[in-house]
């Protein structure tokens, strides 16, 4: 599957359980960030702000294109589904121990920024990405990664942190974003919605796919996170979109087949190493990039975002088993563990690909209206 | 940056309580999972108890199940270790450690995957 090439239709559904965009930031002409689904309150609310459910079921996607496993999202139907009456499903912790508001959840109190003041800064992440908008860099080479196909032994941790899972990564996982720009693979984790709610972290042309995977690195200019957090190109992120497709994928299975012994939060396992690289797209040559933060606290920013263009297809059964396997705090279910996207704030977001360029009937005369930031590089 | 300092340790008995906290600087507390060792002479660091970033999930070693509870209370960035039953044993420099989200994801038993830690408060047992 590949990332289509917009047009300007209807962001089709999903919602997020994240929190608000940050007020007071959208200070720049409107073409810099695209019409954003709307979210329940969380992170950046202010009081007397309608707090609208915004939740929308994703339609299906099983159209065939002519390319081999290629899909562009303006063939589907937008479809307009009524919001659910009911509150985003981890909205409400109940902590086993008192009723202590303090600790950080999705889309709902305590605000992030009071957790983290970085969380309202202006260069945040995750954001909307319009192809149309990004500026091709002919300097963004292909992805190289090393050492990422894994023996089945020693094993790998795999754990339920309470907001996510989390796989441990070993020493030895080598990723250059590009000459001089290399990192080490540490853990990967994932981000997702619920029944018939798409829960990426990023959106594209304001869909919302039905999961994410992230995979974070340390810049090797650094020994330890802590040291690079904050830093720009401290950590960098690869991020691939989840999709439904006809067939279970095998490198994904080894994981989530393991998800019902991590039920509880801050439960771990050990499962056998894996082809790390097989949970990414296979085309390492076209993606987006940027640079924003973490998406969940402390929110540091000076984070290397690197996008796929290409989607990972999972069955419809495999999805259901990420999105409800596993536990949060208290009694929650952890679902919905995605960040509102965030405003662009003059940033520009890059593509290794002439991604603004469409064929489509119903592009006009394409124009890319960003240059490259990185030609020189 | 968190920088965490222990308190609470102190010469006791054969069979006391002891309570000690952790505090915290710095307005990520809650992000952190903490967790608490100790360091007998002569001994390596050894794992005691851990909290998830949240305080819904604890673990314990063995050798202090059902004697030790570890707590937390992020509205006061603070986490707590109280020791029933105390045993000569448990005599030790006791270590507050932070562990961020987005470190390696260690075990929580895994000393290497803490990315802070204060400086200790020592917990001497007589018998």
């Known amino acids: 599957q590949r990332l289509p090439r917009m047009q300007e239709d209807s962001p089709l559904g999903g919602g997020s359980s994240g929190e608000d965009d940050p007020l007071g930031e959208e200070d720049l002409p409107s073409e810099e960030d695209s019409p954003r689904e709307e979210d329940p309150p969380g992170e950046e609310d202010l009081p007397g702000e309608e707090d609208l459910p915004g939740e929308e079921d994703l339609p299906e996607v099983k159209p065939k294109s002519e390319e081999e496993g290629s899909l562009k999202l303006e063939d589907l139907p937008t479809v307009e589904a009524p919001g659910d009456p009911q509150e985003p499903q981890n909205n409400a912790h109940r902590d086993k121990e008192g009723d202590d508001q303090s600790h950080w959840r999705y889309g709902g109190d305590p605000p992030w920024p009071r957790v983290s003041p970085a969380c309202a800064g202006r260069f945040q992440s995750p954001v909307d990405i319009r192809p149309q908008l990004a500026a091709f860099c002919p300097a963004l080479r292909p992805l190289e990664l090393l050492g990422f196909q894994l023996p089945p032994l020693p094993e790998l941790r795999l754990r339920n942190n309470g907001h996510s899972v989390q796989l441990t990564l070993p020493p030895g996982l080598e990723m250059a974003l590009g000459p001089g720009r290399e990192y080490r693979a540490l853990q990967l984790h994932l981000h997702w919605g619920a029944a018939g709610r798409p829960g990426s972290e990023h959106t594209v042309e304001g869909h919302r796919f039905p999961a994410e995977i992230h995979v974070v690195h340390l810049s090797t200019a650094f020994a330890r996170v802590d040291e690079a957090l904050g830093r720009p190109g401290g950590l960098a992120v690869l991020a691939a979109f989840l999709e439904e497709g006809p067939e279970e994928n095998s490198a994904y299975e080894q994981l989530l087949s393991r998800l019902e012994e991590i039920a509880e939060e801050g439960s771990e396992t050990q499962v056998p190493g894996l082809d790390i690289s097989a949970l990414l797209p296979s085309d390492f040559s076209r993606y987006f990039q940027y640079e924003g933060s973490l998406t969940t606290p402390p929110c540091a920013q000076g984070v290397i975002w690197t996008v796929f263009n290409q989607t990972v297809m999972l069955s419809a059964k495999q999805l259901h088993t990420l999105s409800d396997t596993l536990w949060g705090p208290g009694d929650s279910r952890l679902q919905l563990n995605f960040r509102a996207t965030q405003p662009l704030n003059g940033r520009v977001i890059e593509a290794s690909f002439p991604a603004g360029v469409d064929s489509s009937p119903r592009a006009a005369e394409p124009v890319q209206l960003n240059s490259c930031l990185a030609a020189g590089d | 940056q968190v920088q965490l300092q222990e308190s609470g340790g102190g010469l006791m008995h054969d069979g006391d309580s002891l309570r000690l906290s952790c505090a915290a600087s710095?307005?990520?507390?809650?992000?952190?999972?903490m967790g608490w060792f100790r360091q007998a002479p002569g001994k390596e660091r050894e794992f005691v108890a851990a909290?998830?970033?949240?305080?819904?999930?604890?673990y314990y070693a063995d050798s202090v199940k059902g004697r030790f509870t570890i707590s937390r209370d992020n509205a006061k960035n603070t986490v707590y270790l109280q020791m029933n039953s105390l045993k000569p044993e448990d005599t030790a420099v006791y270590y507050c450690?932070?562990?961020?989200?987005?470190?390696?994801?260690?075990?929580?038993?895994?000393?290497?995957?803490?990315?802070?830690w204060g400086q200790g408060t020592q917990v001497t047992v007589s018998s």
């Open positions: 450690a932070a562990e961020g989200i987005y470190n390696s994801g260690s075990s929580y038993h895994d000393a290497n995957g803490y990315d802070y």
């Open positions: 710095g307005r990520t507390f809650s992000t952190y999972a």
């Open positions: 909290i998830s970033w949240s305080g819904g999930s604890t």
